[in-house]
């Protein structure tokens, strides 16, 4: 029998390589049984995670899982960094793994690095 605890399925050590100026949706996969929990996004600043209060978010429902989406319209260079989603469920706070956005600023990048380059050589993003 599957657990009815809320689960947040952001992949551990996950990364997204994205371009400034593009739209982007950051998904937090949420598994729950009955009542949909209250979910929020925050951005890591050192050891603290700063809640993103005024950002556009939405829900997307699929057959066995739902997604709480943080919208970037468009992506800005200072969106670079690590994000986490968290859910309040039966007075418990459940936190996801963090996921990292590597933002390439197209104005400063002479050419667009490949996904593999960006994954293996993140310093390319800060040229």
């Amino acid at each position: 029998k599957e657990s009815c605890d809320v689960q947040l399925y952001i992949k551990r050590q996950s990364e997204h390589s994205i371009l400034a100026g593009d739209p982007f949706e950051l998904e937090c996969p949420v598994k729950y049984c009955a009542n949909r929990p209250h979910v929020t996004w925050c951005k890591l600043n050192g050891t603290t995670c700063v809640k993103l209060e005024d950002r556009q978010t939405s829900w997307k429902e699929e057959k066995n899982i739902s997604f709480f989406i943080l919208h970037f319209e468009p992506v800005l260079p200072n969106d670079n960094g690590s994000y986490r989603c968290s859910a309040n469920f039966q007075s418990n706070l459940i936190e996801s793994h963090s996921t990292t956005l590597y933002v390439t600023d197209v104005k400063s990048a002479s050419e667009r690095p490949s996904k593999d380059e960006m994954a293996s050589r993140p310093w390319l993003l800060y040229r």
Epitope: R12, I65, A119
Partner: antibody, heavy 119, light 112 residues
Framework: QVQLVQSGAEVKKPGASVKLSCKAS????????AHWVRQAPGQGLEWIGR????????KYDPKFQGRATMTADTASNTAYLELSSLRSEDTAVYYC????????????WGQGTLVTVSS | DIVMTQTPLSLSVTPGQPASISCKSS???????????LNWFQQRPGQSPRRLIY???KLDSGVPDRFSGSGSGTDFTLKISRVEAEDVGVYYC?????????FGQGTKLEIK
């Protein structure tokens, strides 16, 4: 239940390339990582790397960086490993491995594909 | 890279007797999320590896409770309380805290 079905055995000459496939079923392919691990005859296990099928993001052991290429096709729920400039030391069984919702815990293993590199 | 060192590299055990395998990592495997990504795998002759234990001590479903895992930081142990004939094979520890992920060199378990 989770199933990972890998392509059949390959025999290649030194310097050639090989592309292995791993078809996943029984879970949402996009919500997990696909890893590749190899094992030379009579030797131990060696992690090659992993791919996030949702966005194509990859991580490789530096030993394989530049010679190994992992890709994933979410339409067919298939992960691929291409290894180029083959040498005899690449003779091994290559396993594809999936984990539960991207936990990176190597939960489910395929049956393996034997690649033999010989002139 | 994190080096995983297993001892012994082989052991021969009488059925019903206990067995213990040690795994030492070159660096603490405690991740920033508070979890320790240390697994144990069993590979029976001619088969794919299968996971026995994850996150140091959590037993996979279907794994007999004679298997147990313990440890923290850099020192980890796999114990079999009473070895059975079906336990023959090679046992590997593995770390998934740091890239690149690495395996121990393996410990071959034989029955006396």
């Amino acid at each position: 239940q989770v199933q990972l079905v890998q392509s059949g055995a390959e025999v290649k000459k030194p310097g050639a390339s090989v592309k292995l496939s791993c078809k996943a079923s029984g879970y949402n392919f996009k919500h997990t990582y696909a890893h590749w691990v190899r094992q030379a005859p009579g030797q131990g296990l060696e992690w090659i790397g992993r791919i996030d099928p949702a966005n194509g993001n990859t991580k490789y052991d530096p030993k394989f960086q530049g010679r190994a290429t992992m890709t994933a096709d979410t339409a067919s729920n298939t992960a691929y490993l291409e290894l180029s400039s083959l040498r005899s030391e690449d003779t091994a069984v290559y396993y594809c491995v999936a984990d539960h919702y991207g936990s990176s815990l190597l939960d489910y293993w395929g049956q393996g594909t034997l690649v033999t590199v010989s002139s | 890279d994190i080096v995983m060192t297993q001892t012994p590299l082989s052991l021969s055990v009488t059925p019903g007797q206990p067995a213990s395998i040690s795994c030492k990592s070159s660096q603490s495997l405690l991740d920033s999320d508070g979890k320790t990504y240390l697994n144990w795998f069993q590979q029976r002759p001619g088969q794919s590896p299968r996971r026995l234990i994850y996150l140091v001590s959590k037993l996979d479903s279907g794994v007999p409770d004679r298997f147990s895992g313990s440890g923290s930081g850099t020192d980890f142990t796999l114990k079999i309380s009473r070895v059975e004939a079906e336990d023959v094979g090679v046992y590997y520890c593995w770390q998934g805290t740091y890239f690149p992920y690495t395996f121990g060199q393996g410990t071959k378990l034989e029955i006396k």
